[in-house]
Interface confidence: low
Amino acid sequence: DAHKSEVAHRFKDLGEENFKALVLIAFAQYLQQCPFEDHVKLVNEVTEFAKTCVADESAENCDKSLHTLFGDKLCTVATLRETYGEMADCCAKQEPERNECFLQHKDDNPNLPRLVRPEVDVMCTAFHDNEETFLKKYLYEIARRHPYFYAPELLFFAKRYKAAFTECCQAADKAACLLPKLDELRDEGKASSAKQRLKCASLQKFGERAFKAWAVARLSQRFPKAEFAEVSKLVTDLTKVHTECCHGDLLECADDRADLAKYICENQDSISSKLKECCEKPLLEKSHCIAEVENDEMPADLPSLAADFVESKDVCKNYAEAKDVFLGMFLYEYARRHPDYSVVLLLRLAKTYETTLEKCCAAADPHECYAKVFDEFKPLVEEPQNLIKQNCELFEQLGEYKFQNALLVRYTKKVPQVSTPTLVEVSRNLGKVGSKCCKHPEAKRMPCAEDYLSVVLNQLCVLHEKTPVSDRVTKCCTESLVNRRPCFSALEVDETYVPKEFNAETFTFHADICTLSEKERQIKKQTALVELVKHKPKATKEQLKAVMDDFAAFVEKCCKADDKETCFAEEGKKLVAASQAALGL
């Protein structure tokens, strides 16, 4: 539909509250360093302008595109050049180049202070004093730290954040009520951000076709009773929603996501039997619920795939006539039969099938050539199955912390050039796959584990892209989206790496480590472990374990000492000397 005023159209569709929240998210995701007050001012100006357009769609500038309106507003920020450097050059460009320029300057790892949680009473006072500002600040802080966070989903998080404070600030024990809820929101928020980052990377780095293939596979697993045409319609609409959000078109994205949820709920009967509860919820909860809904039961009478995709004499004719539709059908049919496979595995199988048809349909006897194509799938299926089995056994043997340490060592040896904070963050997240997925029965392990690993390895890829230091990482990240995990798994110790010079300062610790939370203390120890491996990449597991055990004992001893700082200074020197000797540094 063509609207005289796009800004009026979106304001009316979304309502003032959601409009303002989404504009704030959009601005904070673009200008990540701007103070909160500056963003609120810009949002209020845009909102007032939108209201004039609602009153009269023919008013001056109301016919301008949202990118033009928002870009013009962002470019009024006085300190743009001082704060953002070359991003200010975006403002010299015209749309659509200006928006593309802003998108390219989004920073996945902005130099912002860690969010420190104030005391519960302080938070409750701030919440009661000015609820609106308190919630806006939440949106602003999350959006600027996560510039690709899925905006309509962030509205859902904000709604839960508000509900937590509304309930808990009246409770007898405010902290006991509030803190677990905030921890849950924080952890879910990080996971949600990382999942969306993969969707945006998929669209931006590998194109719409790659995203659509992912969506066909995932939706076919989730809605195995839906017809192919129905799944294809959902994929087309979902692709539009995510393309918009990843492109900074947050108002359109939120509006289209609401339309998609409405369509799904109106057509439940031809999509899935699992949607009933979701569809009874209010809009934000409904959309979230649909996105997380469990897989429907597979139809009982599905025929063998071989008939249509191997045995039929028309395979090449069908393939040649409409390649992507035929491959889409293959992926749909395979995925709906295999909720036990990861999406990336299904995409590897589809790619193998496509490659086989490309080769065989040009051969003298195509049918003879592709007759055994399903046999080629066996090793592709077994590889992740075996890897997950081995790693779940290791996880069950070691527990999460030591399993993370094993992965830290493994990945530091593979790509030692990567920065230590990135290696720690990524390896810790890789290690969480154990507690997240190994508890599941076999039929659910692979989709849980391998699709989660895809999300985590994408974090490595986007962080590495900002400051590329390793050709091996670049290669695994850019060659094939679906083969990233096998590519990293296949990396051996980097024999070309020149060990880091030993620096005693890296291994100097102070009494402040004693007041850290258990998680922060683990991160300190894991940082030291990465540095150790960078100094001595050929160190054995046993050597590293011995040094880490000594280190843990040293921290425990000094944290119990009366004069902690002296203990850390004196015992620390001894520990460094002993570690150097043990590792032959």
Partner: nanobody, 115 residues
Framework: QVQLVESGGGLVQPGGSLRLSCAAS????????MSWVRQAPGKGPEWVSA????????RYAETVKGRFTISRDNLKKTLYLQMNSLKPEDTAVYYC????????GSQGTQVTVSS
């Protein structure tokens, strides 16, 4: 709700013409290749003709080449099959499908060629 509704069938004498239409709804018609398939009494489905999503690439079964023409109007979300020089062996139920699938169960339209 995804729907494909065929129309335009009927009784025609050998050598005569018919134009079949297939109105699509509930999915992004312009994104998909489409086909016409027919099923004669007591026989399995037989692929007749296909057209790509943009309408540029068309394909025909040997049995209808030179007599049938497939076309589409993406704005109207409609697929067509112009059938000329009809023969008694063209008698069948004709139905349209997405891509080259014969799995989607639409009602079809009956074409009978008889003197």
């Amino acid at each position: 709700q995804v729907q494909l509704v065929e129309s335009g069938g009927g009784l025609v004498q050998p050598g005569g013409s018919l134009r079949l239409s297939c109105a699509a709804s509930g999915f992004t018609f312009g994104s998909f290749g489409m086909s016409w398939v027919r099923q004669a009494p007591g026989k399995g489905p037989e692929w007749v003709s296909a057209i790509d999503s943009g309408g540029a690439d068309t394909r025909y079964a040997e049995t209808v080449k030179g007599r049938f023409t497939i076309s589409r109007d993406n704005l109207k979300k409609t697929l067509y099959l112009q059938m000329n020089s009809l023969k008694p062996e063209d008698t069948a139920v004709y139905y349209c499908t997405i891509g080259r699938s014969t799995s989607r169960g639409s009602q079809g339209t009956q074409v009978t060629v008889s003197s």
